[in-house]
Interface confidence: low
């Protein structure tokens, strides 16, 4: 079932998924100037059986302008360069999350995708949190949250972080300190407030999401 | 990707009642993204009034419409509202609705700063009489 929330509001600290787990959702978003394929995904999602799980559907971006032609999947290094550092990718996860049965590992990019990714995370997902860029992180307790079905709703547990505003940074389970941090958080992305939903379908829903009410056609 | 189009903007008394609607259009899944509201006054900056994440669990809203204004969402309906209650004068502008990817790798939080809005509306009129 998908989470029909987002992660807790930590003042001055992101969240990170080290791995995925079935179910999840990543929407197949394209860069300006470019759109998905006709008849291309409107996500991939996180599928698999108990011993190896694999993102379904390949996203495909063409570009705005050219209706018929497509772009291969395989980024070119230089479209690779120009994503954001938002997306760490698969270096930055420790072996023991990236490998659990059940999970993804963090999908490679497509040519010409959005600098920024989009999930839709299921209960049982687990995040990691850290304290923006000239925050100090004081753990009272783990710095992660869970997304858990109670009584028929889902919830995010609380993560045990408080970030203070010291200059110095906390680090995601398994990372080193950035020496200068090239992977550093953009500027315009360290606000403090937080955002979340109710995105409230099941799972098994997935497969029709392309005609779902949560789908908005072109006019 | 994503088309805005506001609704509900006219003239009220101070004191009165007005709701703004923003209708979303695009083949996207709408609940992808944060919305807010912006308001521009003949000659000012575009300011800020409230901002609601992708799921409604979170909102935001300027000092200046705490307790009078409320932002909701209908991901059903791939609309956002406005709820304008107690109005002033001041309330008076041309209101935007904004919207921006949230990235769910690294969290993206409620943005309040007007450049960190991808796709904007063209905007409806409130006027605020005494």
């Known amino acids: 079932e998908l989470c029909d929330d987002d992660p807790p509001e930590i003042p001055h600290a992101t969240f990170k998924a080290m791995a995925y787990k079935e179910g999840t959702m990543l929407n197949c978003e394209c860069k300006r100037g470019f759109r998905r394929i006709k008849s291309g995904s409107l996500y991939m999602l996180c599928t698999g059986n108990s011993s190896h799980s694999s993102w379904d559907n390949q996203c495909q971006c063409t570009s705005s302008a050219t209706r018929n032609t497509t772009k291969q999947v395989t980024p070119q290094p230089e479209e690779q360069k120009e994503r954001k550092t938002t997306e760490m990718q698969s270096p930055m996860q420790p072996v023991d999350q990236a490998s659990l049965p059940g999970h993804c590992r963090e999908p490679p990019p497509w040519e010409n995708e959005a600098t920024e990714r989009i999930y839709h995370f299921v209960v049982g997902q687990m995040v990691y949190y850290q304290c923006v860029q000239g925050y100090r992180a004081l753990h009272r307790g783990p710095a992660e949250s869970v997304c858990k079905m109670t009584h028929g709703k889902t919830r995010w547990t609380q993560p045990q972080l408080i970030c203070t505003g010291e200059m110095e940074t906390s680090q995601f389970p398994g990372e080193e300190k950035p020496q200068a941090s090239p992977e550093g958080r953009p500027e315009s992305e360290t606000s403090c407030l937080v955002t979340t939903t109710d995105f409230q379908i099941q799972t098994e829903m997935a497969a029709t999401m392309e005609t779902s009410i949560f789908t908005t056609e072109y006019q | 990707q994503l088309q805005l189009v506001e609704s509900g903007g006219g003239s009220v008394q101070a004191g009165g009642s007005l709701r703004l609607s923003c209708a979303a259009s695009?083949?996207?899944?709408?609940?992808?993204?944060?919305m807010a509201w912006f308001r521009q006054a003949p000659g000012k900056e575009r300011d800020f009034v409230g901002s609601?994440?992708?799921?409604?669990?979170?909102?935001s809203y300027a000092d200046s419409v705490k307790d009078r204004f409320t932002i909701s969402r209908d991901n059903a309906k791939s609309t956002v509202y406005l709820q304008m209650n107690n109005t002033k004068p001041e309330d008076t502008a041309v209101y935007y609705c904004?919207?921006?990817?949230?990235?769910?790798?690294?969290?993206?939080?409620?943005?309040?700063?007007?450049?960190?809005?991808?796709?904007w509306g063209q905007g409806t009129q409130v006027t605020v009489s005494s």
């Open positions: 609601i994440s992708r799921y409604g669990t979170y909102t």
């Open positions: 695009g083949r996207t899944l709408y609940s992808s993204y944060g």
């Open positions: 904004a919207a921006y990817t949230y990235s769910g790798s690294f969290y993206s939080t409620v943005k309040t700063h007007r450049d960190e809005y991808q796709y």
